[in-house]
Amino acid sequence: TQNKALPENVKYGIVLDAGSSHTSLYIYKWPAEKENDTGVVHQVEECRVKGPGISKFVQKVNEIGIYLTDCMERAREVIPRSQHQETPVYLGATAGMRLLRMESEELADRVLDVVERSLSNYPFDFQGARIITGQEEGAYGWITINYLLGKFSQKTRWFSIVPYETNNQETFGALDLGGASTQVTFVPQNQTIESPDNALQFRLYGKDYNVYTHSFLCYGKDQALWQKLAKDIQVASNEILRDPCFHPGYKKVVNVSDLYKTPCTKRFEMTLPFQQFEIQGIGNYQQCHQSILELFNTSYCPYSQCAFNGIFLPPLQGDFGAFSAFYFVMKFLNLTSEKVSQEKVTEMMKKFCAQPWEEIKTSYAGVKEKYLSEYCFSGTYILSLLLQGYHFTADSWEHIHFIGKIQGSDAGWTLGYMLNLTNMIPAEQPLSTPLSHSTYV
């Protein structure tokens, strides 16, 4: 029989990304003898858990175990049995759980407790489930894309291994869009980070990085839509909301109780003379854009410059990888090409939003209506966030690279999270004398 005394020469790690709208399980693999080399870890599997995000299980925690079963069983199939007990499993929950914790710490703890108990029942090396901070989410996303792009490698290459590579060691900024939050992370050019909360210092592979990061809670695409609806229904004359962010002919009934369920809409909450209202799409990009801009408070800035809501943002610097929902939405809209200018993107969004709902449904028959109906809003929101929120311009737009995968690994925070927790990003060059693990990220 196979004995533990003869470990395999590869290792595996599992990270579950418990997002606001869904949970995904990622399996990573790397050669055991090259743990400290940059770029050796790669993703071998992604399993999307069927169902909503874990925060939605607050009233049915007993269902969490079943919810996680299929993807955990998939992990047992993919990873060799002899490796199961040595394979670390981490679960990181993001903004959906941050919002639940804001409402009730007790309920958030209960959900996490059941998640932990469910995951510890598997024959892996379960290392815990926790709500990661927005700052961590931004930082780990930045680490992931730069690790995969080979930016931490000191060996200069004459060839390019990925389409976005510029053959220099200048790191990429990271733009991450989720359902409940969005993160912006990059190394500013010789600029002091005026707000300490937004400053991170890393020493990776012998080089120091001063990184800016911020996570905007409630500004993920789903929560931004709830915010917009809550804002717009305030001024509606009756229970019909004529909404420019939905296609002409689209209709949907919304419960007011659902609208005010999230902490993100608290600032717009008011007593309405109805329990439900109907969204009626009118499909107008420009009006949708204007409505979205009202979510960004740009009138107040206690720093030399801000993004919105009084949050410091240094001048943008270098290239950016835009991933997660930035990529998924733009990919659906066929707008991820490097050749498509910002003006062209805007033009195409205008045309897309103006298309009648019946026509859209016919054109995209295989897409779930719930998702299909929101692409006009999401695309418009992405443009508004990047241009007015983060101050990208028509010129700097070409520095945004919409990235789904880099060399087969998904862009996102999970790989960076695992690299850090497994101590696979050394502070110094691996060839130099190893330092204690206290110097890791």
């Epitope: 029989t1 196979q2 533990k4 049995r81 199961h84 007990q85 024959p123």
Partner: antibody, heavy 121, light 107 residues
Framework: EVQLVESGGGLVKPGGSLRLSCAAS????????MNWVRQSPGKGLEWVGE??????????HYAESVKGRFTISRDDSKNTLYLQMNSLKTEDTAVYYC????????????WGQGTTVTVSS | EIVLTQSPATLSVSPGERATLSCRAS??????LHWYQQKPGQSPRLLIY???QSISGIPARFSGSGSGTDFTLTISSVEPEDFAVYFC?????????FGGGTKLEIK
């Protein structure tokens, strides 16, 4: 030689407590998940519970029938596994085996000789 | 929890004959099924792991097969020392469970 030796069994009244020990030798105890399995007189085998490693924060799992009453612990420095049994019931009467798997997991290729626990008034 | 049902409860065979013991799981457990032999006054002994994997030191006449919910332990030619009780065990998920056992007795 790989060996597991249980001790601590005996006669105890219902509601009473008992602590079983299992001394391990011949293998690196701290590297392996350890289990307790019991067998009632003339009956089949029943898994009692497991304890994992220090790296797993010594995580434990139990059969529903003993949950809240039995506690498994280990002392890696002494190569010893323990089973603390509280609120004992007559149906806990059994031979208790200390077991482990030196290959892979969740099957038992090493067994102790067993120690008998009798719960009776 | 996964329930394992063994059949028959008692199997009578003569030495030299073939013995076929069955174990059925209440839900699919892939190949996570293990077989043990127990003789009176002794601790159980692992015979087969992961449905069909043989253990060094166990005679080749013992073999296992099956996957999903139906599993079989076969003794190709029963020897006198094989008369004992045989248990199957779910090694797929917690709680770990055992079948009720099949007693192999001399005919």
């Amino acid at each position: 030689e790989v060996q597991l030796v249980e001790s601590g069994g005996g006669l105890v009244k219902p509601g009473g407590s008992l602590r079983l020990s299992c001394a391990a030798s011949g293998f690196t105890f701290s590297k392996y998940w350890m289990n307790w399995v019991r067998q009632s007189p003339g009956k089949g085998l029943e898994w009692v519970g497991e304890i994992r490693l220090k790296s797993n924060k010594y995580g434990t799992h139990y059969a529903e029938s003993v949950k809240g009453r039995f506690t498994i612990s280990r002392d890696d420095s002494k190569n010893t596994l323990y089973l603390q049994m509280n609120s004992l019931k007559t149906e806990d009467t059994a031979v208790y085996y200390c077991t482990t798997q030196l290959d892979l997991y969740w099957f038992f290729d090493v067994w102790g000789q067993g120690t008998t626990v009798t719960v009776s008034s | 929890e996964i329930v394992l049902t063994q059949s028959p409860a008692t199997l009578s065979v003569s030495p030299g004959e073939r013995a076929t013991l069955s174990c059925r799981a209440s839900q699919s457990i892939s190949d996570y099924l293990h077989w043990y032999q127990q003789k009176p006054g002794q601790s159980p002994r692992l015979l087969i792991y992961y449905a069909s994997q043989s253990i060094s030191g166990i005679p080749a006449r013992f073999s296992g097969s099956g996957s999903g919910t139906d599993f079989t332990l076969t003794i190709s030619s029963v020897e006198p020392e094989d008369f004992a009780v045989y248990f199957c065990q779910n090694g797929h998920s917690l709680p770990l469970t055992f079948g009720g056992g099949t007693k192999l007795e001399i005919k």
